[in-house]
């Protein structure tokens, strides 16, 4: 019957994805048992995305590669609500690369996934960005103003945040 074949397909997909993410945490979305949305374990989920805090210290380029190998990218922050969710999982004494860079050093900031850079939805610390040679963005904590963004040199190793769309099976 229909439900049986759907379950068989779902198990097949789960097995296939296990080679990339050994464990997935899935939830039924809405009332329809057909729709399962999954995030790799132990990634966290918010709205339609999954997030992973990488504690290894790497350059921006290596951090982005690390995310992309997993089917993700360095995080693109689209709303204040999304940033508020992300910071719940960060450590105050650490800095984390975002998927935001200025490759030409001309203050043309661009998100790694080509999301248009919107000045009205940015969370720079006061006085930032402040150096044309600092072409990559991090999020960090400053006691005076809590969590915000700062521009830094891309080669300086930092922790990072990966983001991917939820996996639907």
């Amino acid at each position: 019957n229909f439900m049986y074949s759907k379950t068989v397909k779902r198990l097949s997909k789960l097995r296939e994805y296990q080679q990339y993410h050994p464990s997935l945490t899935c939830v039924m979305e809405g009332k329809d048992i057909e729709d399962w949305s999954c995030c790799p374990t132990p990634w966290t989920s918010f709205q339609s995305s999954c997030y992973f805090i990488s504690t290894g210290m790497q350059s921006w380029t290596k951090s982005q590669k690390n995310c992309s190998v997993m089917g993700a990218d360095l995080v693109v922050i689209n709303t204040r609500e999304e940033q508020d969710f992300i910071i719940q999982n960060l450590k105050r004494n650490s800095s984390y690369f975002l998927g935001l860079s200025d490759p030409g050093g001309r203050r043309h900031w661009q998100w790694v996934d080509q999301t248009p850079y919107n000045e009205n939805v940015t969370f720079w610390h006061s006085g930032e960005p402040n150096n044309l040679d600092e072409r990559c963005a991090i999020i960090n904590f400053r006691s005076s103003e809590e969590w915000g963004w700062n521009d830094i040199h891309c080669h300086v190793p930092q922790k990072s945040i990966c983001k991917m769309k939820k996996i639907y099976i």
């Epitope: 990339y20 982005q64 089917g71």
Partner: nanobody
Framework: QVQLQESGGGLVQAGDSLRLSCTAS????????MGWFRLAPGKERKFVAA????????DYVDSVKGRFTISRDNAKNTVYLQMNSLKPEDTAVYYC????????????????????WGQGTQVTVSS
């Protein structure tokens, strides 16, 4: 680790055609979105074309639209770039790239989003 190998490059006249192939070692090739990029002398690596995991969605840089076609054969672990009406400005080393993707429609058009790259194949178009 996904291994990619391009082939099919060569020296042709303006107006001629070539078909590039890129074969992947990964047995679950159908879970990888693919792209073609090119690197011309003295320039930076530029996006040419991209294709989704299912092959149902494609995208091209404006300068090759209507002339180039990207396609894939998941049974053969291969992605193709059919290049027609070639121009001298198409001269470059062409690279294919792969990225794990769990959707059937997403496309990736920037180099940092691809972790896996081939060694490249030279295409030279003489006038």
């Amino acid at each position: 680790q996904v291994q990619l190998q391009e082939s099919g490059g060569g020296l042709v006249q303006a107006g001629d055609s070539l078909r590039l192939s890129c074969t992947a070692s990964e047995r679950t090739f159908s879970n990888y979105a693919m792209g073609w990029f090119r690197l011309a002398p003295g320039k930076e690596r530029k996006f040419v074309a991209a294709i989704s995991t299912s092959g149902g969605t494609t995208d091209y840089v404006d300068s090759v639209k209507g002339r180039f076609t990207i396609s894939r054969d998941n049974a053969k672990n291969t992605v193709y770039l059919q290049m027609n009406s070639l121009k001298p400005e198409d001269t470059a080393v062409y690279y294919c790239a792969a990225r794990l993707d769990f959707s059937s429609t997403d496309l990736y058009t920037t180099a940092p989003r691809y972790p896996y790259w081939g060694q490249g194949t030279q295409v030279t178009v003489s006038s």
